[in-house]
């Protein structure tokens, strides 16, 4: 049993490194903002017994504008740097572990293809011919300027770009 | 089609720094967020960090104070830069154009570079 995709939260970001159950994962603020006192950035994808269904806990995370950072002149569109934001010290911290590292699941990535649009984001669709994953464009409301700039770029997933002895961890919905 | 290269792995002492960089290539090079990733011979893959992009970052504890990502959309380049290194930082180090499930939900894709050899030893 896997977990499907986490909820998205406003101005903050996860990188999702396995959808296993009880994976613990962390929201990250984006630049500019910060992790509101008194909320927490973690979720954990737990099983809920009556509906034998996975799902992610939903995080109490608020990310609001930095003060520290408002009055900043923005960096140049053409380059990101990483200064400004430093996750805060959370009273549930993660164990440590980094269970994408633990156990390889099934690879389910293979048939995904991903289209990365300028100023968008991506969302999944089941097609219905195959069952398989796609993506398609979707509005962000959190696209920098350097990505409404950029060119296209296209992924199409396919297993022979896996580094040898590496099993991405894929993700499945529910059952 | 896109293609990802790493550079930078090298041999270097207890203590020292490395730059990776990774560079994309292909039709463009829009990405909403890159991962890091190593591998040593015989172990699972561990994941290192990532750079989100508005630029935040998030870092596995046992880099958390001393890896730092950035990336430069110019040069279409992504770096992870090392310090304080460790033996236990030994490893081919790959980077990872993620795909984006949700809004600000990114996962790894199936698209990853060739690897760069890291060597930490005296």
């Known amino acids: 049993i896997t977990c499907p995709p986490p909820m998205s939260v406003e101005h903050a970001d996860i990188w999702v490194k396995s959808y296993s159950l009880y994976s613990r994962e962390r929201y990250i603020c984006n630049s500019g903002f910060k992790r509101k006192a008194g909320t927490s950035s973690l979720t954990e994808c737990v099983l809920n017994k009556a509906t034998n269904v996975a799902h992610w806990t939903t995080p109490s995370l608020k990310c609001i504008r930095d003060p520290a950072l408002v009055h900043q002149r923005p960096a140049p569109p053409s380059t990101v740097t990483t200064a400004g934001v430093t996750p805060q010290p959370e009273s549930l911290s993660p164990s440590g572990k980094e269970p994408a590292a633990s156990s390889p699941s099934s690879n389910n990535t293979a048939a995904t293809t991903a289209a990365i649009v300028p100023g968008s984001q991506l969302m999944p669709s089941k097609s219905p011919s195959t069952g398989t994953t796609e993506i398609s464009s979707h509005e962000s409301s959190h696209g920098t300027p350097s990505q409404t700039t950029a060119k296209n770029w296209e992924l199409t997933a396919s297993a022979s770009h896996q580094p040898p002895g590496v099993y991405p961890q894929g993700h499945s919905d529910t059952t | 089609e896109v293609q990802l290269v790493e550079s930078g792995g090298g041999l270097v002492q207890p203590g020292g720094s490395l730059r990776l960089s990774c560079v994309g290539s292909g039709d463009g090079f829009s990405i909403s967020a890159v991962g890091w990733y190593r591998q040593t011979p015989g172990k699972q893959r561990e994941w290192v960090g990532v750079i989100f992009s508005s630029g935040s970052t998030d870092y596995a504890d046992s880099v958390k104070g001393r890896f730092t990502i950035s990336r430069d959309n110019a040069k279409n380049t992504v770096y992870l830069q090392m310090n304080s290194l460790k033996p236990e930082d030994t490893a081919v180090y790959y980077c990872?154009?993620?795909?984006?499930?949700?809004?600000?939900?990114?996962?790894?894709?199936?698209?990853w570079g060739q690897g760069t050899q890291v060597t930490v030893s005296s």
């Open positions: 990872n154009a993620g795909v984006t499930t949700n809004r600000g939900v990114h996962r790894e894709s199936n698209y």
